[in-house]
Structure formats: structure tokens, C-alpha cells
Amino acid sequence: TQDTFRGSVLEGVLPGTSVMQVTATDEDDAIYTYNGVVAYSIHSQEPKDPHDLMFTIHRSTGTISVISSGLDREKVPEYTLTIQATDMDGDGSTTTAVAVVEILDANDNAPMFDPQKYEAHVPENAVGHEVQRLTVTDLDAPNSPAWRATYLIMGGDDGDHFTITTHPESNQGILTTRKGLDFEAKNQHTLYVEVTNEAPFVLKLPTSTATIVVHVEDVNEAPVF
């Protein structure tokens, strides 16, 4: 026997979308009498957000569908429905089961820089030097393509001196020097970095930009003939 069922549905789907089916068996006769005819109903929903009627169940098939708009994984990632199955077509004995509805993630949240402004100091001539770690927040499912950040230097790196990679665990952007900086040539660089996700956005979202002011520190260099 099974008293817990599991299903899933994408966040933001339209009412009428089918989620899953639950089934209860009854050995009694269902042809000549109603003794074995099972009727399904939803007894309760937890949590009751955004309200307590997000799902409906087909009385005779046990198919659970979305009845209301507003499924938002970032607010409620899982719903727990208590399902009642009653024989005699709803007038007889009742048994209960649990249906867990997992709300699947869509990339409906953009990563946002926090903070958006950074200042860093780098000794001149240093190659592969970690300049700054940039931090983003993203409300989508952790460690998924909708959460993982992709960083791009949009401006301020005319000499192609910098590179930025994504830390696989923290999701931070790690800004490093690709080649040595020359204090005597330019003692300050202002970089503009944009962040997006590995996965495309499912709707038009504003992209976040960070500004990094990099101060180049003078290193005493030997005289050259």
C-alpha cells in the first residue's frame, strides 16, 4: 500500500495544469453497487499560501490539477495535500493519504550584486592575482543553472588585463589579473561587471551591474639602462 504520493509542477503554470494522480483500491463490487466506487477529495493543503485552494482533485480519477495562479517556488517550494478517498461514491468509509507537490524552478529571478560597488588594491606586475570576490544573491533553486552566475566584464578593461570566473560553490565572481598592471602607465582601473545565469531568464529581467575600482600599487622596480 502507498499512503504518500509525490508529484511536481513548474512554478507559474496556468490553472488547469495536471500535476499527478493518486489511486486508492477497493475490493468491493463497483459494477452492480456503489460499495467499491471511490470518490476523491482534498481535505487540507499546507501551507495555505498564497491561499488554501491552489489545487483540485478529480472526484473519480484522482487526478490533481492546479486550480489557481500564483505557484511561486521562491515562496513555497513544496505543498502537502491531505487526500481523502471515500467508497460508496463518497458516502461510505474514508481513508486518507498525503500528496507532496514539488514546485519546480523556473529562472524567474535575476542574480543581484550585493554590494554593487567594490574597491581593490593590486600590486603592479602581478599575474593571476586575485583582485576581488564579487557576491551575488539569487532566489532561484541553489546550485541549479537558474542560480549559477555567469560574469562578464562589460567595460573598463581596455587592455584586457582582467578575467572573471565563477566559484563553483559560493557562486562568487573571482576577479583576477590576466596580465600584469603597470602603475606608471595607469594607476587606477574602473571595471563594470554584469551578471546573468547559466540558464536563460524565462521573462524579461533587469541585469545587475557592479563597479570595481582597482587601485594599482607601485612596486619598486630596478633601473633599466
Epitope: 502507498q2 509525490r6 511536481s8 499546507e46 499560501d49 515562496k75 513555497v76 502537502t80 514539488e102 546550485n143
Partner: antibody, heavy 120, light 113 residues
Framework: QVQLQESGPGLVKPSETLSLTCTVS????????WTWIRQPAGKGLEWIGR???????NYTPSLKSRVTMSVDTSKNQFSLKLSSVTAADTAVYFC??????????????WGQGTLVTVSS | DIVMTQSPDSLAVSLGERATINCKSS????????????LAWYQQKPGQPPKLLIY???TRESGVPDRFSGSGSGTDFTLTISSLQAEDVAVYYC?????????FGQGTKVEIK
């Protein structure tokens, strides 16, 4: 590295309310379910309930009438309140994070646990 | 609730030998749409919180030695320690997360023979 730390009174009188707070450091409270689990001395683990960073909650049916959980994302904290306690609620209380890898449910980070004794 | 039953309650194994712990769920914890078993294994040493070893029945948590492995599907699962070390003495728990209401097995105590 994410770390969790429970805090609250170690002694609660019968019929009163047990209150515990878990402080999360080294990571954000956002995007995850945060859980309370208890363990009576020499016994197994009992799941009490969980709260999502948005405030959405689930409680174990046997304790549902007595449990309230809350979250404060600005402080990176979440809390447990268990009302009308009896000696049977004496246990080590753990806070934990539900990890995520294509689904929630397993506990990948735990607090050290705090012993709560119910006694007059 | 889904009831998790572990066997044996305790076992004594010689150093370097294989230790096998079984876990049975009262209903299947396999979600066929994802082809994943919603089952985890933990290790708990005295005075410490449990430590995650395995999730999705067979995925080893980062940093866990490869002598620990998980297997099984549906209702029957196994945690295997291929070559028992002194530091593996602990109580081991299985846990299902197929249901919202998470439940643990009663625990299996592993000692050195």
C-alpha cells in the same frame, strides 16, 4: 562554510513554552528549508518541522498543535517555540539545513545541539 | 508517516572488514518521474550531531571517504562500509524525504569486534 548554532534556555518548567533560536553564519538563510530535529537521551532522531526562508512551514502531525516556527532573514536566524511542554519533551534539540540538489530533504549542515530539560 | 526500519540494531565488525546496514521503508521512496530514491544516510558519534554521508540513496556527500557506499531502490536500502576503520564506530541512521514529514530509522550501532 555554513555553520549553525542553537541558543536558548536549557531548563524549562512543565506547561511552559520552550523557545530556541538557530543562528546561521557563513552563508545566507535564503533559498533553503531550515529544520528542527530532537533526540531524547539514548534514543533516535525525531523530525519536528521546517521553515522555508519565505516563512512557509511544515510541522510533524503529532506536534503540530504545539509548534510554531519563524524566520528572520535580516538576522540570518530561525526559531522554534514548543508550548505546553512536559518531561517527554526533554531532549537534545538540533537545528539543521535541508540541502538542495534537484530537490530538498536531506540534512547537510547541523548545529551542535542544545540540551533542553523540562523540569520544575 | 513512512516508517523506516533498520537492521540489525547493532553489529560488531573486525577492523578492515565489511559492515552492512539495512534499511527498509514502509512504502516506496522512489519517485519515478525523477528516477530518484528519496533516502539519506547519517553517521552520529557520541556528543556530536549526525553527519550526512549519502543522499539520493547512493550519492556520497563531499568529503565522505569512498569506503562508504549506499545502494538499493524502492523500499530496501543498504549502507556498506567496505573496510571498517576505528573512526567509523558510531550510530548510523537512514532517513526518508519522500514525504514532507521526514522520518528516521531507529539507528544501527557499529562497534569493533
Amino acid at each position: 562554510q555554513v555553520q549553525l548554532q542553537e541558543s536558548g534556555p536549557g531548563l524549562v518548567k512543565p506547561s511552559e513554552t520552550l523557545s530556541l533560536t538557530c543562528t546561521v553564519s557563513g552563508g545566507s538563510i535564503n533559498n533553503y528549508y531550515w529544520t528542527w530535529i530532537r533526540q531524547p537521551a539514548g534514543k533516535g532522531l525525531e523530525w519536528i518541522g521546517r521553515i522555508y526562508s519565505s516563512g512557509s512551514t511544515n510541522y510533524t502531525p503529532s506536534l503540530k498543535s504545539r509548534v510554531t516556527m519563524s524566520v528572520d532573514t535580516s538576522k540570518n536566524q530561525f526559531s522554534l517555540k514548543l508550548s505546553s511542554v512536559t518531561a517527554a519533551d526533554t531532549a537534545v534539540y538540533f537545528c539543521a539545513r535541508e540541502g538542495y540538489n534537484d530537490g530538498y530533504g536531506y540534512f547537510d549542515h547541523w548545529g551542535q545541539g542544545t540540551l533542553v530539560t523540562v523540569s520544575s | 508517516d513512512i516508517v523506516m526500519t533498520q537492521s540489525p540494531d547493532s553489529l560488531a565488525v573486525s577492523l578492515g572488514e565489511r559492515a552492512t546496514i539495512n534499511c527498509k521503508s514502509s512504502q516506496s521512496v522512489l519517485y519515478s518521474s525523477k528516477n530518484k530514491n528519496y533516502l539519506a544516510w547519517y553517521q552520529q558519534k557520541p556528543g556530536q550531531p549526525p553527519k550526512l554521508l549519502i543522499y539520493w540513496a547512493s550519492t556520497r556527500e563531499s568529503g565522505v571517504p569512498d569506503r562508504f557506499s549506499g545502494s538499493g531502490s524502492g523500499t530496501d536500502f543498504t549502507l556498506t562500509i567496505s573496510s571498517l576503520q576505528a573512526e567509523d564506530v558510531a550510530v548510523y541512521y537512514c532517513q526518508q524525504y519522500y514525504s514532507t514529514f521526514r522520518t528516521f530509522g531507529q539507528g544501527t550501532k557499529v562497534e569493533i569486534k
